[in-house]
């Protein structure tokens, strides 16, 4: 798998992972106790390129282009976990890894 | 062949709007980025703004963020540059010019406009 | 944002003489460079992306050289039609810059 990290001055056109910070503290997120703030990233830019798609099937229905079906999108293909501690519905203090918060590669799918 | 089609400039007071528009044929237009450039009285070229094909990611230089916005109309093959809040600094001849996609970065204009002048003054 | 500096700022050539003009970058912009031309009254042309490649219809005595943040634009011969304005410009960062510029002048 292979994916492309850029910074936010980039002028890269294709599919790419932009580094983002989340602030918990800025949403107004305060059942949220720790990290306060994390390296969250995103993914932008085009999908155009076979090399940055997922799936082959990805590539072939694009070429297919059935009615209704959209281009390829550039969205995350892998995911990683970040522990939390945080308070739940029922006030109690809660230590946990919340699944599919970071994102560690952009491709297109 | 590839042509793009300018207008909408003319004299506006300090502190008016003015909306530019580009007219684009001989290329699939939506799959294009397309960008403004102004050049000031005998002065040097200034990239102003630049719109990703979709339309769906757009750019600014510092010198007209919130005060200029750029857009496209795809269906119409169709560039537009509104401009509010206008000052004196803004007297420029204002170029739309579309991305060559000659590599993966955007930002190589291979296809520019016939110009149009823009005169801020009251 | 990346400055480009461009010198001369003009240049007085011969018909037929090389011409050698340079472009600085303050910080890296790989090779994403391109060079363009202006006439009075005209827009600009695009004459080389990527340092060195030349864009369709641009002719040989064009060549462009450099990397990192030092570039060249050599023209081999000067022709009439090459009397003009020459800019330099980086799209490696947003935002897009221009060089200043350099003149092309009849001596």
């Known amino acids: 798998d292979f994916g492309l990290d850029c910074d936010e001055h980039s002028t890269e056109s294709r599919c790419c992972r932009y580094p983002l910070t989340v602030d918990f503290e800025a949403f107004g997120w305060d059942w949220i106790i720790a990290p306060k703030r994390y390296k969250a990233n995103y993914c932008s830019g085009e999908c155009e390129f076979v090399f940055l798609q997922k799936y082959p099937h990805t590539h072939l229905v694009h070429q297919a282009n059935p009615r209704g079906s959209a281009g390829p999108c550039c969205t995350p293909t892998k995911m990683s976990p970040i522990n939390m501690l945080y308070f739940n519905g029922k006030e109690q203090i809660i230590y946990g890894k919340i699944p599919a918060m970071v994102v560690d590669r952009c491709g297109c799918s | 062949q590839v042509q793009l089609v300018q207008s909408g400039g003319g004299l506006v007071q300090p502190g008016g709007s003015l909306r530019l528009s580009c007219a684009a044929s001989?290329?699939?237009?939506?799959?294009?980025?397309i960008s403004w450039v102004r050049q000031a009285p005998g002065k040097g070229l200034e990239w102003v703004s630049t719109?990703?094909?979709?339309?769906?990611?757009?750019y600014y230089a510092d010198s007209v963020k919130g005060r200029f916005t750029i857009s496209r109309d795809n269906s119409k093959n169709t560039l537009y540059l509104q401009m509010s809040s206008l000052r004196a600094e803004d007297t420029a001849v204002f170029y739309c010019?579309?991305?060559?996609?000659?590599?993966?970065?955007?930002?190589?204009?291979?296809?520019w406009g016939q110009g149009t002048t823009v005169t801020v003054s009251s | 944002d990346i400055q480009m500096t461009q010198s001369p700022a003009t240049l007085s050539v011969s018909p037929g003489e090389r011409a050698t003009l340079s472009c600085r970058a303050s910080?890296?912009?790989?090779?994403?460079l391109a060079w363009y031309h202006q006439k009075p009254g005209q827009a600009p042309r695009l004459l080389i992306y990527?340092?060195?490649t030349r864009a369709t219809g641009i002719p040989a005595r064009f060549s462009g050289n450099g990397s990192g943040t030092e570039f060249t634009l050599t023209i081999s011969s000067l022709q009439s039609e090459d009397f003009a304005v020459y800019y330099c410009?980086?799209?490696?960062?947003?935002?897009?810059?221009f060089g200043g510029g350099t003149k092309v002048e009849i001596k």
């Open positions: 410009q980086q799209h490696n960062n947003w935002p897009l810059t």
């Open positions: 719109i990703t094909g979709s339309g769906y990611n757009t």
């Open positions: 990527g340092v060195s």
């Open positions: 910080q890296s912009v790989s090779s994403n």
């Open positions: 001989g290329f699939t237009f939506n799959t294009y980025a």
């Open positions: 010019a579309k991305d060559s996609r000659y590599n993966w970065n955007y930002g190589i204009f291979d296809y």
